[in-house]
């Protein structure tokens, strides 16, 4: 299907600010991760799927002088198919993900 | 509190593949995106939030040869406030979203 | 499944030695195969493989200089050829059939002494 | 190159017993890790791969575990034709290596 704005009089509600304000507050996050040769090894030629997602800490804070960053981690482990033509294997491997998130004085 | 892994003996189960690969593949998702001076104007000194959050695609393809690309987008607007000190004030701002997604041919 | 090795060569120092690999047809071209060798009460070491569909190969740095992978489609038959022998490469090399990348079959190795 | 280090030159054991081989890589290797049981005079016989998955033939006393570094092949009730030598391999990345192998005697 050819790239579709919404029709011209449609006209969408506007997000509230508490609501735009809670989803942007710092706070554990789905985001992708592209899977990588250091992760994956040398002997897969081609993994699926290509990148993975987990929760990471993200969204911003109410100063410039401070960041998102985890306080709260642990590793998660994921099934990956590893193929090498013609066979293929499922293998597994680990990220970390967040589970905690805090705003706190950037480093120097 | 300080940045805490889980307890060493506490082994999470595996993602199975079928969960990671249904995760990761192209679609609508939630990102976080900085509020830039061409986005809101020279006059606010400081946006609250800093950041808002919209779905746009992301994920990945089954093949290095396709990309993932919005097949279906709308304005969305989001109350931000514009804060000029001693002042501020409620505004509102526009950004494009994703309501659908596709893996389609990478552009030569 | 197991691969076919014959068992044993005796080859002067500084020659070359071709061993052979027969598999089953099928196997043979829808596999990747190993070669690994033993040396006398040693551990085993990776010398490279091939996969016989597209003769694209894989080797150990290690034996790249000197260690040959070849494949002849027709007779299912895999080649390996050691060249510039010293009595350090006295040892067993086993033809072996990979599953994505361990070891699932293997031949029963071929005996190579490098002596004068 | 990816190191397999595997300790335990030697164990001895007593048919019934339990005893554990242990392999440590020197870079994380997920789970692209197999074992390989060899008796005297004999070729390499394949027992586990994905650290943890049976070959298909061999007894369910031989049970592997780990992930990342740190693997370990198990034998519950050990048997008389377990006296062997085991080695671990990665797969992760090439070169393809193995650990120098663990010789198993009865006591």
């Known amino acids: 299907p050819v790239s579709q704005p919404d029709a011209p009089g449609h006209q969408r509600k506007v997000v509230s600010w508490i609501d735009v304000y809670t989803r942007a507050t710092c706070q554990p996050r789905e985001v992708v991760v592209p899977l990588t040769v250091e992760l994956m090894g040398t002997v897969a030629k081609q993994l699926v799927p290509s990148c993975v997602t987990v929760q990471r800490c993200g969204g911003c804070c109410p100063d410039d002088g401070l960041e998102c960053v985890p306080t709260g981690q642990h590793q998660v482990r994921m099934q990956i198919l590893m193929i090498r033509y013609p066979s293929s294997q499922l293998g597994e491997m680990s990220l970390e993900e967040h589970s905690q998130c805090e705003c706190r004085p950037k480093k120097k | 509190p300080v940045s805490q892994p889980d307890a060493p003996g506490h082994q999470r189960k595996v993602v199975s593949w079928i969960d990671v690969y249904t995760r990761a593949t192209c679609q609508p998702r939630e990102v976080v995106v900085p509020l830039t001076v061409e986005l809101m104007g020279t006059v606010a000194k400081q946006l609250v939030p800093s950041c808002v959050t919209v779905q746009r695609c992301g994920g990945c393809c089954p093949d290095d040869g396709l990309e993932c690309v919005p097949t279906g987008q709308h304005q969305v607007r989001m109350q931000i406030l514009m804060i000029r000190y001693p002042s501020s004030q409620l505004g509102e701002m526009s950004l494009e979203e994703h309501s659908q997604c596709e893996c389609r041919p990478k552009k030569k | 499944v197991q691969p076919q090795q014959p068992g044993a060569e005796l080859v002067k120092p500084g020659a070359s030695v071709k061993m052979s690999c027969k598999a089953s047809?099928?196997?043979?071209?829808?596999?990747?195969i190993g070669w690994v060798t033993q040396r006398p009460g040693q551990g085993l070491e990776w010398i490279g493989d091939i996969f016989p569909g597209s003769g694209h190969t894989n080797y150990n740095e290690k034996f790249k200089n000197r260690a040959t992978l070849t494949v002849d489609t027709s007779s299912s038959t895999a080649y390996m050829l050691l060249s510039s022998l010293t009595s350090d490469d006295s040892a067993v090399y086993y033809c072996?059939?990979?599953?994505?990348?361990?070891?699932?079959?293997w031949g029963q190795g071929t005996l190579v002494t490098v002596s004068a | 190159d990816i190191v397999m280090t595997q300790s335990q030159k030697f164990m001895s054991s007593s048919v019934g017993d339990r005893v554990s081989v242990t392999c440590k890589a020197s870079?994380?290797?997920?789970?692209?890790v197999a074992w390989y049981q060899q008796k005297q005079g004999q070729s390499p016989r394949p027992l586990i791969y994905s650290a943890s998955s049976r070959c298909s033939g061999v007894p369910d006393r031989f049970t592997g575990s780990g992930f990342g570094t740190d693997f370990t092949l198990t034998i519950s009730n050990v048997q008389s034709e377990d006296l062997a030598e085991y080695f671990c391999?990665?797969?992760?990345?090439?070169?393809?290596?193995f650990g120098a192998g663990a010789k198993l005697d009865l006591k």
């Open positions: 391999q990665q797969y992760h990345s090439f070169p393809l290596t």
């Open positions: 047809g099928d196997t043979f071209t829808n596999s990747w």
């Open positions: 072996v059939i990979e599953n994505y990348a361990w070891f699932a079959y």
């Open positions: 870079q994380n290797v997920n789970t692209n």
